[in-house]
């Protein structure tokens, strides 16, 4: 019993005095608490409290299920307790067969003993299998058997307490352990597309993955800026224990201009928290917006490829593509593809392939697209770069020694005499009139030039050379003529090509 | 022995919030779990969460997160449940019982009416 | 979520009775199904649990049996006072789930 100094409060005394009591089922229980200040007795196994407001406690036919702690309080808040094992051999446990695990945390089965004598208190699993390997436990008589330190892995494992009672194995009645998870990491979200792209009126429709080892992950979608909570429909699964996955559907049946916008998948637990964004962008009408790849004005010499390639952002998807030239369509050549095989691409390429071009094939090439909603075109400038071609070369009659040339660039012409019977024309001769004649052909073909030169300026016998040229070549015709007296023979026009 | 008595009946005005309140005596309270279920006007038994007071954190029915909070007061053995954003269809007699699982124990019931 | 699908939604029996009324699991819950007793204005009351362990100081005419997807509760003989609705709820995975309870009543 307690002991205390003079003067100062002291705790209760009890009668047995002794920390322990055995007695038999059937015999009587009969504890005396004394202190002038006393209040009550207190009784406390498992799940049951009782209060006593006599000093005496009296239990005339003890049963297995007055074992347990018997408290008794004075006024000062001072205790003393006394514990009560009732012998019963055909109930060696008291039982509460509810028992959760926190995993990681220690446990109790609660399986208190009522008699204190029996030998290897422990526990066993159910229908004689084992426990798992590495599940550890302390026994104690009266309050029952913690298991240390619980795993996931003991979730619905079936348990018995035991004793040996002259030689033989008692269980108790079972016990299923139901493991509740720790968090220890954030919940993984995903979303089923980054964005979306929607006509007015058109459903928006979008879920959000959510998945964590409990149904007790939070999770929520939010529009970011608001606190308006949005219409949500939920499927869940459980793959197993501790595998929960969570569908949060978010639906806007009939999607407007200012529905667009960002929106989020958040979810948390007790560990931390993780989102995931959509973004919706919904417009009153279709577009298509073309975004040519190359210049629009395209120059290319006579016999090379070139490509005309654009790329074009189109919703609701394109329905018809085609490329024009001259009022007529291309049926090959040309190929157009989605940029990306994803499924929310809005943006495609086009390419027409022209080959081995020629002076001729100048001129306006026209991509053409459409939609539900609206077409859109995009127009290429091709000029061909040709060597210029000397088309005529003659002497009027006024005497004028002329020279027709067409090619693109604008080919320039320039005129040279060479004396006797010389090869090198160097010395040059001004013309006297240069004309740009308009083409009869397409706008985008070659252009021509005539240039001429007096002829009665030259005095002696010789070659003269008209020489026309631009970036992409030359090309020269020759006039020879020879004097008899003061006159001139005939003049032999021929021309040479020049690389 | 084990005996749960739960706060009296409300009346809410739509929007708002409610808090039932569910004591528990003649048993030990934090070792047990102690959930709440509803029962809406001659329908069945929906399970809203519970709480295992000792381990602090509560599970609930993704139907009513966000919206409900349970928690439990140790020191007076006392588990609360708080419904928030009240609708019309939130009247209900809403019950305590004991457990997570199944439940062994219930209160008498606490009749929530929401009614603008 | 699980669901549980109960059967018949309601029945008329006399006192003296032998009762069965079944509730199906919408996937596997081993044996994690408990049966509740509920009379008018009063709280439920649990009967079963584990599917087939009676609740201490419930009476014998009242058996469970199954495992899996498949219960039934029996009350082996009605007495006056069993008139009532009778839920199943399954607590294999939270969230628990109820069936939508069968009603029994005095013919």
């Known amino acids: 019993q307690p002991s205390v100094s003079p003067g100062e409060p002291s705790p209760p005394s009890i009668h047995p005095g002794k920390s322990d009591l055995i007695v038999r089922v059937g015999d009587e229980i009969r504890l005396l608490c004394t202190d002038p200040g006393f209040v009550k007795w207190t009784f406390e196994i498992l799940d049951e409290t009782n209060e006593n407001k006599q000093n005496e406690w009296i239990t005339e036919k003890a049963e297995a299920t007055n074992t347990g702690k018997y408290t008794c309080t004075n006024k000062h808040g001072l205790s003393n307790s006394i514990y009560v094992f009732v012998r019963d051999p055909a109930k060696l446990f008291l039982v509460d067969r509810s028992l959760y695990g926190k995993e990681d945390n220690d446990t109790l089965v609660r399986c208190p003993l009522t008699d204190p004598e029996v030998t290897n208190y422990s526990l066993k699993g159910c229908q004689g299998k084992p426990l798992p390997k590495d599940l550890r436990f302390i026994p104690d008589p009266k309050a029952g058997i913690m298991i240390k330190s619980v795993k996931r892995a003991y979730h619905r494992l079936c348990l018995h307490c035991s004793v040996d009672q002259e030689g033989k194995s008692v269980l108790s009645e079972k016990f299923i352990l139901k493991v509740r998870p720790a968090f220890k990491a954030v919940p993984v979200v995903s979303v089923s597309k980054a964005s979306y792209l929607l006509r007015e009126g058109e459903e928006f429709t979008v879920t959000c993955t959510i998945k964590d080892v409990s149904s007790s992950v939070y999770s929520t979608w939010k529009r970011e800026n608001s606190q308006t909570k949005l219409q949500e429909k939920y499927n869940s699964w459980h793959h197993g224990d501790f595998n929960y996955e969570r569908q949060a559907t978010l639906t806007i049946s009939s999607a407007r201009v200012n529905d667009s916008g960002v929106f989020m998948c958040y979810a948390n637990n007790t560990f931390g928290s993780a989102n995931v964004t959509t973004t919706l962008e919904v417009v009153d009408k279709g577009f298509i917006n073309i975004f040519p790849m190359i210049n629009t004005t395209v120059f290319v010499n006579d016999g090379e490829n070139v490509d005309l390639i654009v790329e074009y952002e189109a919703f609701p998807k394109p329905e018809h593509q085609q490329w024009i030239y001259m009022n007529r369509t291309f049926t090959d050549k040309w190929e157009d593809y989605p940029k990306s095989e994803n499924e929310s691409n809005i943006r495609y390429v086009s390419e027409l392939h022209l080959t081995r071009l020629k002076g001729t094939e100048g001129g306006t090439y026209t991509f053409l697209v459409s939609n539900s909603d609206v077409n859109a075109a995009i127009a290429f400038n091709v000029y061909v770069n040709t060597k210029p071609e000397i088309l005529t070369y003659d002497r009027l009659v006024n005497g004028m020694l002329q020279c027709v040339a067409a090619g693109f660039p604008e080919p320039t012409i320039d005129w040279y005499f060479c004396p006797g019977t010389e090869q090198r024309c160097s010395a040059s001769v001004l013309p006297v009139d240069v004309q740009t004649l308009n083409s009869s052909g397409p706008p985008f073909g070659k252009l021509v030039v005539q240039s001429s030169i007096d002829s009665s300026a030259f005095k002696h016998n010789g070659t003269v050379e008209c020489k026309a040229y631009n970036d992409v070549g030359k090309t020269s015709a020759y006039f020879n003529f020879a004097f008899k007296g003061n006159n001139k023979e005939q003049i032999h026009p021929h021309t040479l090509f020049t690389p | 022995q084990v005996q749960l008595v739960q706060s009296g009946a409300e009346v809410k005005k739509p929007g708002s919030s409610v808090k039932v309140s569910c004591k528990a005596s003649?048993?030990?309270?934090?070792?047990?779990?102690l959930s709440w279920v509803r029962q809406a006007p001659g329908q069945g038994l929906e399970w809203m969460g519970g709480i295992i007071p000792s381990f602090g954190t509560a599970d609930y029915a993704q139907k009513f997160q966000g919206r409900v909070t349970i928690t439990a007061d140790e020191s007076t053995s006392t588990a609360y449940m708080e419904l928030s954003s009240l609708r019309s269809e939130d009247t209900a007699v809403y019950y305590c019982?004991?457990?997570?699982?199944?439940?062994?124990?219930w209160g008498q019931g606490t009749l929530v009416t929401v009614s603008s | 979520d699980i669901q549980m699908t109960q059967s018949p939604s309601s029945l008329s029996a006399s006192v003296g009775d032998r009762v069965t009324i079944t509730c199906r699991a919408s996937?596997?819950?081993?044996?994690?199904l408990a049966w509740y007793q509920q009379k008018p204005g009063k709280a439920p009351k649990l009967l079963i649990y584990d599917a087939s362990s009676l609740q201490s100081g419930v009476p014998s005419r009242f058996s469970g049996s199954g495992s899996g997807t498949d219960f039934t509760l029996t009350i082996s003989s009605l007495q006056p006072e069993d008139f009532a609705v009778y839920y199943c709820q399954q607590y294999y995975y939270l969230p628990s789930t109820f069936g939508q309870g069968t009603k029994v009543e005095i013919k």
């Open positions: 996937q596997d819950i081993s044996q994690d």
């Open positions: 019982a004991r457990g997570l699982y199944d439940f062994d124990y």
């Open positions: 003649g048993g030990t309270f934090s070792s047990h779990a």
